[in-house]
Interface confidence: low
């Protein structure tokens, strides 16, 4: 899996949505979980309703929310009052039993808050360039692909 | 008022390696703006070296540099280090920290003078 | 790499006169998410450089408004109205829309 880079500003809120097939995944219940060390476990966030013809109910689990388009195919989680500690690596799952495939690896960074009416793209700083060989810039917030490795982020 | 305090001056032999810091005195920013590396060469101008986003230790480096330096980041103490290896005299220069903003360069640390002589 | 060059490479003014300063990169520095970022600095003797402009033609905080930054593409200038001698130093621009981060390699602005 490729890594999805999600950016953020500080205070405000993010969201992140892992798009997926939706006859593949058809009645399971999905998952958002965060990544412990590179070799570590997932440790499970929040998980879509019980009942998964009502995945479509979001659910919180403290200031992280999700929430399931099963016919459009498409998993939503929302990260709310964003904080320089939310930043890291995570996954999107989709359940079966007690077995979970990834449905995308996301890296969640956070950025400064953008003071005086700036652009909150221009706090995130790396121009655009034609390769990004191990992962993928999301534009949640106005910015562009960058070239260079993702580290694992730290855990602590 | 921004204040970038970088470490000072370092004479170093070819073939050695240094670690200059970069000390930021605003602790609320620091982790989670971009940190940039620059140095300047008499006759040559500016060249960026890399970037890095201390929250999560993301780094990038310009490609001329990738196996020059290496980048880290100390949340704790708010500080930015560029380590620099198998110096050669082509490496003497100002080095300057900066912090990003206004998608530019816009605060600048005072320069460390890195000066690699037998 | 992207290429800023800089014209002329010496400027000399007297005070209270107009200089401009020319800057053209080798592509067009629109970034993807409409914004050009292309930035102008003023390096004094012994000094740090400092940000001017940023974003073409937006006055960072506590540049006097004699500083004017204007352009589009490719071709970028840097006006001041009224020279003082404060102004004296080497200006350069640069940009930051393409990895690596590039600059032009300054224009010294001295007395005449």
């Known amino acids: 899996h490729n890594t999805t880079v999600f950016q953020g500003v500080a205070g405000q809120s993010l969201q992140v949505s892992c798009p997926y097939d939706s006859m593949k995944h058809w009645g399971r219940r999905k998952a958002w979980c965060r990544q412990l060390g590179e070799k570590g476990p997932c440790q499970r966030v929040v998980s879509t309703h019980n009942l998964w013809l009502l995945s479509f109910l979001r659910r919180w689990n403290g200031s992280t929310a999700i929430t399931d388009d099963t016919l459009g195919g498409t998993l939503t989680i929302t990260l709310r009052n964003l904080q320089p500690h939310d930043a890291g690596l995570y996954q999107c799952q989709s359940l079966h039993g007690s077995e979970a495939d990834t449905l995308r690896k996301v890296l969640v960074e956070v950025l400064a808050d953008p003071l005086d009416h700036r652009d909150a793209g221009d706090l995130w700083f790396p121009g655009e360039s034609e390769s990004f060989e191990d992962a993928h810039v999301e534009h949640s917030i106005s910015r562009s692909l960058l070239e260079g490795e993702i580290p694992f982020p730290p855990t602590s | 008022q921004v204040h970038l305090q970088q470490s000072g001056s370092e004479l170093r032999s070819p073939g050695s390696s240094v670690k200059l810091s970069c000390k930021d005195f605003d602790s609320e920013v620091f982790p989670i703006a971009y940190m940039s590396w620059v140095r300047q060469k008499p006759g040559h101008g500016f060249e960026w070296i890399g970037d890095?986003?201390?929250?999560?230790?993301?780094?990038i480096y310009g490609v001329k540099f990738e196996d020059k330096a290496t980048l880290d980041a100390d949340t704790v103490s708010n500080t930015a280090y560029l380590e620099l290896n198998s110096l050669t005299s082509e490496d003497s220069a100002i080095y300057y920290c900066t912090r990003k903003d206004y998608g530019s360069l816009a605060y600048w640390g005072q320069g460390t003078l890195v000066t690699v002589s037998a | 790499d992207v290429v800023m060059t800089q014209t002329p490479l010496s400027l000399p003014v007297s005070l209270g006169d107009q200089a401009s300063i020319s800057c053209r990169s080798s592509q067009s520095l629109v970034h993807i998410n409409g914004n050009t970022y292309l930035q102008w600095y003023l390096q004094k003797p012994g000094q740090s450089p400092k940000l001017l402009i940023y974003?073409?033609?937006n006055r960072f905080s506590g540049v006097p408004d004699r500083f004017s930054g204007s352009g589009s593409g490719t071709d970028f200038t840097l006006r001041i109205s009224r020279v003082e001698a404060e102004d004296l130093g080497v200006y350069f621009c640069s940009q930051s829309t393409h990895l690596p981060y590039t600059f032009g390699g300054g224009t010294k602005l001295e007395i005449k």
């Open positions: 890095i986003l201390p929250s999560i230790g993301r780094r």
């Open positions: 974003k073409v033609s």
